[in-house]
């Protein structure tokens, strides 16, 4: 029919029906990072609390070694936040003589490891230029976004420095995921 | 079995059930905020519009003074936009002498307070040096997470500065939760 | 009951049960952008990809012509990320003689286009001045937050400047939305 | 400071009511929770029920559901505790206190005695 | 409702000794607070979510424990501790204090 532009909707009895109290759901805190090796042109991924104060892991979604697993295939919502913190970056000598005026820069990235395929996908970035003029700074990157995903895929959060990563505080730094 | 690293996910008709649209939901949006008391070493909680334009409440999720009610027990998808502006910060008078170089800071807490807990919680922290050279500075920060939150808990935004708080515009600060 | 405060929640059985697999969902990553007429005072809208990569629309949520369609009515939890990057902006030359000391800006509004009201409403804005002092900058602004919204209606974001959006990788510009 | 001041002592009559006061100074009431917790003579402390003031929802021990009404007024920072039909193993201290916000702050306590 | 049985009933010690006071649930909770009570006056609280020490509470006092059985302990006595103490569970509704345990100077 002209301008029916969308199939009806009213037949809604869809199965598999289940209780959304069932479903995969992770939110993990920041806890202080120990110096691991990471390859080189490849960021460090942290590692987070899973049981303690507001971290949580439930319905078969785990957490080890920096990933979490993911349990069952579907269409997962990713978020995290890393605050940053550090001292005056280089470029804010303003324009001084003889170093490069180039920015640092912080960079938080969600990566998805997974079977079927042979290297890591990155599914979110944040990415941002310092050029801050004051001694020190501190500031946070959040991305969150959803995702199909399968049985078996892995998650992890890199960043460009983990020295930078504030660790203080479980509000301020956190990586989540859970089932639609 | 060898490899069998995740229980089996086909068995999905759990209970109870309930439909979607009946979960508690709320989407607040930011107000004029008139000057209130508040105690020393707290930072202020922002009030909010619960009704009016793209604000509402529904499914027995209610706002009073500053809280957003927590009607039943669940994990709940919690999340902020606090938009500051202001003038040049202190620190932008690059390394004047006499100065303290230290920079300014805008934060926004999402703040739980819980009957089961002695103080209250800070669940979601976004917090930034602002150290700007422009006469007036303007910048979101977001914040969103996942939490499980029990029946008659009470969630409130607090800024470090109410006075920097954007409240001309419902789109550029905000709070909601919804029950997953 | 007396002391009763929230309506009882055991009784969990409601309808219409749908499953949640069969939810409109839609994840749009970054194109490069064509020019394109864009009216005064209006932001330019980005068009995105829908299909390849990461992105996908499913369950009657469809792309097209930098829109997504709303195909029912419901509460849906919509985000975005955009990723801009530019060079030094007027600003920085720090209080420079004959030069207005206006900082520049980024902008993002995710916007909603419905039958029922004559002209686009704007859901979520971020917007952030950009004085930067190094040569290149560029930062991410990100928006997400749940709206009720009508079958029929339509979504797009719009930028202040599309020349500065960051088109270079799927996973720093993005767009989506799905029904709670 | 933070303090609650109660009101002062109560003796009643089997079957009556008794309605005391616990008025909230240093803090916004609606910010906390705000209790009653009992403690007959030489016995052990009991707690009764919870208001919280920003929305007047209340949470009662069963024991005390169909006897007890906890109640507030924001304006002048004061929370209520009415217990109705008092028998004399009502006779005790009544104390509020308070959740949600540390400093733990608890009232002097209210001598309620209840005596044909 | 969650029972909380603490033991000893009372605990006869000598200043600068060590106390130890335990609270055993019915059934698992999450956090458990004690109060220190004397003579007259309102409890007072010592340690909040198992384990954490209330403003102006000596670091002679701490308190473990987790599910069903936390501790409370003193690690020196000093002449103002001896009193009533009381566990209390804010897992379940209702909240349940236990019967206490009174410290006397042996």
């Known amino acids: 029919l002209k301008g029916q532009e969308f199939a009806p909707s009213h037949q809604q009895v869809y199965a598999p029906l289940r209780a959304d109290g069932d479903k995969p759901r992770a939110h993990l805190t920041v806890v202080r990072q120990t110096p691991t090796q990471h390859f080189k042109n490849q960021f460090p991924a942290l590692h987070w609390e899973h049981e303690l104060g507001l971290a949580f892991t439930k319905n078969r979604m785990n957490y080890t070694n920096k990933f979490l697993l993911i349990p069952e295939s579907g269409d997962y919502f990713i978020y995290s936040q890393v605050t940053f913190r550090g001292m005056t970056s280089e470029c804010s000598e303003i324009r001084q003589a003889g170093r490069p005026n180039k920015p640092d820069s912080i960079t938080v990235v969600i990566t998805k490891v997974t079977d079927s395929y042979p290297e890591p996908t990155q599914l979110l970035m944040g990415t941002k230029s310092v050029c801050e003029v004051g001694s020190n700074w501190f500031q946070p990157i959040y991305l969150g976004a959803m995702f199909s995903l399968q049985e078996g895929d892995k998650l992890m959060v890199n960043v460009s420095d983990i020295s930078l990563v504030d660790y203080t505080k479980e509000d301020k730094t956190f990586f989540g995921a859970f089932l639609l | 079995l060898k490899g069998q690293e995740f229980a089996p996910s086909h068995q999905q008709v759990y209970a109870p059930l309930r439909a979607d649209g009946d979960k508690p939901r709320a989407h607040l949006t930011v107000v004029r905020q008139t000057p209130t008391q508040h105690f020393k070493n707290q930072f202020p909680a922002l009030h909010w519009e619960h009704e009016l334009g793209l604000a509402f409440t529904k499914n027995r999720m209610n706002y009073t003074n500053k809280f957003l009610l927590i009607p039943e027990s669940g994990d709940y998808f919690i999340y902020s936009q606090v938009t500051f502006r202001g003038m040049t910060s202190e620190c932008s008078e690059i390394r004047q002498a006499g100065r303290p170089n230290k920079p300014d800071s805008i934060t926004v807490v999402i703040t739980k307070v819980t009957d089961s807990y002695p103080e209250p919680t800070q669940l979601l922290m976004g917090t930034k040096s602002v150290c700007e050279v422009g006469s007036n500075w303007f910048q979101p920060i977001y914040l969103g997470a996942m939490f499980s939150l029990q029946e008659g808990d009470k969630l409130m935004v607090n800024v470090s500065d109410i006075s920097l708080v954007d409240y001309t515009k419902e789109d550029k600060t905000f709070f909601g939760a919804f029950l997953l | 009951l007396k002391g009763q405060e929230f309506a009882p929640s055991h009784q969990q059985v409601y309808a219409p049960l749908r499953a949640d697999g069969d939810k409109p969902r839609a994840h749009l990553t970054v194109v490069r952008q064509t020019p394109t007429q864009h009216f005064k005072n209006q932001f330019p809208a980005l068009h995105w990809e829908h299909e390849l990569g990461l992105a996908f629309t499913k369950n009657r949520m469809n792309y097209t012509n930098k829109f997504l369609l709303i195909p029912e009515s419901g509460d849906y939890f919509i985000y975005s990320q955009v990723t801009f990057r530019g060079m030094t902006s007027e600003c920085s030359e720090i209080r420079q003689a004959g030069r207005p000391n206006k900082p520049d800006s980024i902008t993002v509004v995710i916007t909603k286009v419905t039958d029922s009201y004559p002209e686009p409403t704007q859901l979520l804005m971020g917007t952030k001045s950009v004085c930067e002092v190094g040569s290149n900058w560029f930062q991410p602004i990100y928006l997400g937050a749940m709206f009720s919204l009508q079958e029929g209606d339509k979504l797009m974001v719009n930028v202040s400047d599309i020349s500065l959006v960051d088109y270079t990788k799927e996973d720093k510009t993005f767009f989506g939305a799905f029904l709670l | 400071q933070v303090q609650l001041v109660q009101s002062g002592a109560e003796v009643k009559k089997p079957g009556a009511s008794v309605k005391l006061s616990c008025k909230a100074s240093?803090?916004?009431?609606?910010?906390?929770?705000m209790h009653w917790v009992r403690q007959a003579p030489g016995q052990g402390l009991e707690w009764m029920g919870r208001?919280?003031?920003?929305?007047?929802?209340?949470k009662y021990d069963p024991k005390f559901q169909v006897r007890v009404t906890m109640t507030r007024d924001t304006s002048t920072s004061t929370v209520y505790m009415e217990l109705s039909s008092l028998r004399s193993e009502d006779t005790a201290v009544y104390y509020c206190?308070?959740?949600?916000?540390?400093?733990?702050?608890w009232g002097q306590g209210t001598t309620v005695t209840v005596s044909s | 409702e969650i029972v909380l049985t603490q033991s000893p009933g009372t605990l006869s010690l000598s200043p600068g000794e060590r106390a130890t006071l335990s609270c055993r649930a019915s059934?698992?909770?999450?956090?458990m607070y004690w109060y220190q009570q004397k003579p007259g006056q309102a409890p007072r609280l010592l340690i909040y979510?198992?384990?954490n020490l209330a403003s102006g509470i000596p670091d002679r006092f701490s308190g473990s424990g987790s599910g069903t059985d936390f501790t409370l302990t003193i690690s020196r006595l000093e002449p103002e501790d001896f009193a009533v103490y009381y566990c209390?569970?804010?897992?379940?509704?209702?909240?349940?204090f236990g019967g206490g345990t009174k410290l006397e100077i042996k």
């Open positions: 208001i919280d003031p920003a929305s007047g929802h209340t």
């Open positions: 209390q569970q804010w897992s379940g509704n209702p909240r349940t």
């Open positions: 059934s698992s909770v999450s956090y």
């Open positions: 206190s308070r959740s949600g916000g540390l400093p733990d702050v």
């Open positions: 979510a198992t384990s």
């Open positions: 240093g803090f916004d009431i609606q910010d906390t929770y």
